[in-house]
Structure formats: C-alpha cells, structure tokens
C-alpha cells in the first residue's frame, strides 16, 4: 500500500513539475525590467527564451520573436537546449511511469517489469529536474552578470549634458516557476526510485505454498523469485526484479532459511 502511495505521489509530483517546466519554458518573463532605483517609465520591458515583449502603461503589449539562431547568445541557446531536454525526458518519463503504476494493470505485466519501468521513469524525472534547474540557474547567472555590468555602465561616461538610461533586467517570474518545477520533478523522480525498491522486496512472500518430497532439496535464489499473488489460476513462481545486478558466475544458490519448504 505504501509502495503504491509513494509511486502514485511521485507520479503526481513529477507531473506537476513537468507541467511547470513546460510553463516556464514558454513564459515570456524570464527577465523583467528592473524598476528599483530607476526612473519610472511608461514602458515595461520583459524577455523570454523565445521572444521579448514591451508593455505600455495603456496595456498595449508588443512581442517580437528572436527570428535568428546564429545571432543569439550561446548561453541563451544552452538554456533553451537544457529546458527542451528536460521537457522531452520528463514527457518520456511520464509515459513510462503511467505503465509502471502499480494501480494500473496492463495484461500480464510482471512486477519486475513494473519495477524496472518505475526506476527508469524515476531516473528520467531526476535528470529532467536537474536540466530545468541547471537551465534556469545558467540564465539567472547570466542576468546577474549583465545586471552588474549595466549598473557599472550607468555610473560611467556621464560627462555630457545628455544622460542615457541603461535598461537593467532582473529575475522574472519564469525563473522561480522553473526552479520550483525542477525541484518538484526531482523530488518526484526520487520518490519513484524509492517506490521501485518497494516493488522488489528482498524476501520472498509465499501465498501459494508448494510441497516437495523430502528427498528433493529445491534451492531457490534468495529474493530472486516470488510466488504468484493469486490472480487467476497461475501459481507458478515468477522471476521478479532483482535489486542487485549480478554476473552469471554470481548467480549461485546458497542454502538459507528460505530454501526449504
């Protein structure tokens, strides 16, 4: 029950996180005009990954796309790439995790397959979240650098009578959305990975007990098999996900308290 809850919660948290990453990527407010200690203008500038916008006090807003690839800063291109990779990985992760959910039964999918898929989606969510956090952080760093450069420019070269106003940009709403969304996706991924361990318990739980003649000592690989949970008439032992990766040589059966029935 706890495993199902952890897996379900991980899925929901990741879903919210990826929706947030998509929203942040599409938002225009990655950087907004800094209003602090600046002359008050009747025009407000803000920029996104894909276009820059200007909102006049009347409410009229005009946005212009960046209709160039080569002319854009490499850092902006890198941020775009990180966000897109994050979205793609997150979307694939969501798709995989839907089939991995314990509460959803698809044909006769084994628990081992579900465990593998849960782990895969968890890793994808973690990487997706890290991509988003990295992308937003790179952009934020770029803003901080430019902010102090433009601040320095504001106080130099003002010998003439005519003053020029340097538009400075600060953190926009999209950055905070991106950080939170990336964090949620990361947390969701960790929860999926935790749930994966629960889907593959170390000990074997028997519901259908098989009896053997005393002369036959049937050795099972510890934790490697699990008796059927009793759906349908299938009472054969099923191989489930084995937490530790082992080589062929290592797969030997040593006597344990679980070996004999």
């Amino acid at each position: 029950m706890a495993v199902t809850a952890c897996q379900g919660l991980g899925f929901v948290v990741s879903l919210i996180g990826i929706a947030g990453i998509i929203a942040a990527t599409c938002m225009d407010q990655w950087s907004t005009q800094d209003l602090y200690n600046n002359p008050v203008t009747a025009v407000f500038n803000y920029q996104g990954l894909w276009r820059s916008c200007v909102r006049e006090s009347s409410g009229f807003t005009e946005c212009r796309g960046y209709f160039t690839l080569l002319g854009l800063p490499a850092m902006l291109q890198a941020v775009r790439a990180l966000m897109i990779v994050g979205i793609v990985l997150g979307a694939i992760g969501l798709l995989v995790s839907i089939f991995a959910l314990k509460c959803i039964r698809i044909g006769s999918m084994e628990d081992s397959a579900k465990a593998n898929m849960t782990l895969t989606s968890g890793i994808m969510f973690i990487v997706s979240g890290l991509c988003a956090i990295a992308g937003v952080s790179v952009f934020a760093n770029m803003l901080v650098t430019n902010f102090w450069m433009s601040t320095a420019n504001m106080y130099t070269g003002m010998g003439g009578m005519v003053q020029t106003v340097q538009t400075r940009y600060t953190f926009g709403a999209a950055l905070f959305v991106g950080w939170v969304a990336g964090g949620l996706t990361l947390i969701g991924g960790v929860m999926m990975c935790i749930a994966c361990r629960g889907l593959a318990p170390e000990e074997t739980n028997y519901k259908a007990v098989s009896y053997h003649a005393s002369g036959h000592s049937v050795a099972y690989k510890p934790g490697g098999f699990k008796a059927s949970t009793g759906f349908g008439s299938n009472t054969k032992n099923k191989k489930i996900y084995d937490g530790g990766a082992r080589t062929e040589d290592e797969v030997q059966s040593y006597p344990s308290k679980h070996d004999y029935v």
């Epitope: 005009q33 002359p39 008050v40 203008t41 009747a42 025009v43 500038n45 803000y46 920029q47 820059s52 916008c53 200007v54 006049e56 006090s57 009347s58 409410g59 009229f60 005009e62 212009r64 005519v162 003053q163 020029t164 106003v165 538009t167």
Partner: antibody
Framework: QVQLQESGPGLVKPSETLSLTCTVS????????VHWIRQPPGKGLEWIGV???????NYNSALMSRVTISVDTSKNQFSLKLSSVTAADTAVYYC????????????WGQGTMVTVSS | DIVMTQSPDSLAVSLGERATINCKSS????????????LTWYQQKPGQPPKLLIY???TGESGVPDRFSGSGSGTDFTLTISSLQAEDVAVYYC?????????FGGGTKLEIK
C-alpha cells in the same frame, strides 16, 4: 464617437480645493486611461497626471502633494482634485484619453477655464 | 524630470514650403526593448485643444495628412511639414511619453511668411 467633457467651477478662491470632472463617452473606462493637462493663459501645456485603466495613477512631481485623480466607472467620470490652489493654478484644464499605443493623448476635451481669485 | 527643449520658438514659412521644428530631450526616449522612441507631436490651433499628430516619433496618427512626418531618435527629434498649407498655422508641441512625469516642450508657433 469618443467624447470627453470637462466641467467644474470657473472660479475658485485661493487655498481652496479645485474639483473638476471629466465625463466621457464612446469608449470603455476599463480599457483606456485619462490624462489631465492644463494650459495657463498664453503659455504652453503642462501635464498634471494620468489614471490608467487598471486604476494606477502617475502625477507631475511638482504637483504630486496637491493632486488626486480618480475614476467613477458607474458614472463614466474621471475627477481631478487640486488642493491649496494659488493664482498660479489659473489655467484652461483639459482631460484627454490615453491612446492605446505610443502613450500619446488621442482625444481631448474642449477644456474648462478655471480662475483662482479671491 | 525630463526637460523638452523646442526650437525655434516661432517660425515663419511661405505657403508650399517645408517647415522644420526641432525637439531635444534631456534623456534618451528610445526604449531598448522595442527600439521605439516615445516622443509625441501635437498641433494646437487657436481656441482649440491640442490634436495628436505623431506618436513613436515617426508614426502618423490616422487622419493626419501625409505632409506631416516625424523623425529622429534618442534625444533629437524633428517634425517636418513638407508643403505648408494655410490650415497648418498653429502651435506645435513635442511631448516626452517615456518617463514620468510626461513633459511637454515649450511649443513652436508656426506662421505663414
């Protein structure tokens, strides 16, 4: 069509508060802002302030301590209050609609003459 | 506050001739975000309220004759009337529409020579 009409007392005593109303028609108060401008006799234009569609206001820094601009959407009216008036406040007072783009003033009222005198 | 300086104070031009009015602002009116200059030109005829002619320094308001054109960027702007007509006799004002408080130039009185 778009129309703006200023109204108010033509004569105000010094130190009193000047109250003017701008009644508008032909446009939505939730879409357009309104500016107040004045013009002393034989002189140039002086911007007093603006109230934007969202309700935010901006004022001339020289008049900020004395001026208040407000809106009554139910009556389609904008109002200007200027306190502690002096003879220097004698002027023709205009209200004008804020253009949707360019921050210009695209429609103007005919103006109302206000004289400050005892 | 932004200071708008117009020149000349008055101008006399013959009918059909070109009239040029200059306006200088104490700070740039160019917005880097959209590369537009927030300068507006108005025409005020005697006994009438001002009329919007040009916004964004060079965009003509609808209904304004083509002979009126605006140019310039940053801090220096020009209003040009390509061929002066009798009905163009008026006072012309430039306005800072970028920084609060919005400020007007002192005006240029245009007359016929």
């Amino acid at each position: 069509q778009v129309q703006l009409q200023e109204s108010g007392p033509g004569l105000v005593k010094p130190s009193e508060t000047l109250s003017l109303t701008c009644t508008v028609s032909g446009f939505s108060l939730t879409t357009y802002g309104v500016h107040w401008i004045r013009q002393p006799p034989g002189k140039g234009l002086e911007w007093i302030g603006v109230i934007w569609a969202g309700g935010s206001t901006n004022y001339n820094s020289a008049l900020m301590s004395r001026v208040t601009i407000s809106v009554d959407t139910s009556k389609n009216q904008f109002s200007l209050k200027l306190s502690s008036v002096t003879a220097a406040d004698t002027a023709v007072y205009y209200c004008a609609r804020a253009a949707y783009y360019g921050n210009g003033l695209d429609y103007w009222g005919q103006g109302t003459m206000v004289t400050v005198s005892s | 506050d932004i200071v708008m300086t117009q020149s000349p104070d008055s101008l006399a031009v013959s009918l059909g001739e070109r009239a040029t009015i200059n306006c200088k602002s104490s700070q740039t009116l160019l917005n880097s975000g959209n590369q537009k200059n927030y300068l507006t030109w108005y025409q005020q005829k005697p006994g009438q309220p001002p009329k919007l002619l040009i916004y964004w320094a060079s965009t003509g308001e609808s209904g304004v004759p083509d002979r009126f054109s605006g140019s310039g960027s940053g801090t220096d702007f020009t209003l040009t009337i390509s061929s002066l007509q009798a009905e163009d006799v008026a006072v012309y004002y430039c306005q800072n529409a970028y920084f609060y408080p919005f400020t007007f130039g002192g005006g240029t009185k245009l007359e016929i020579k």
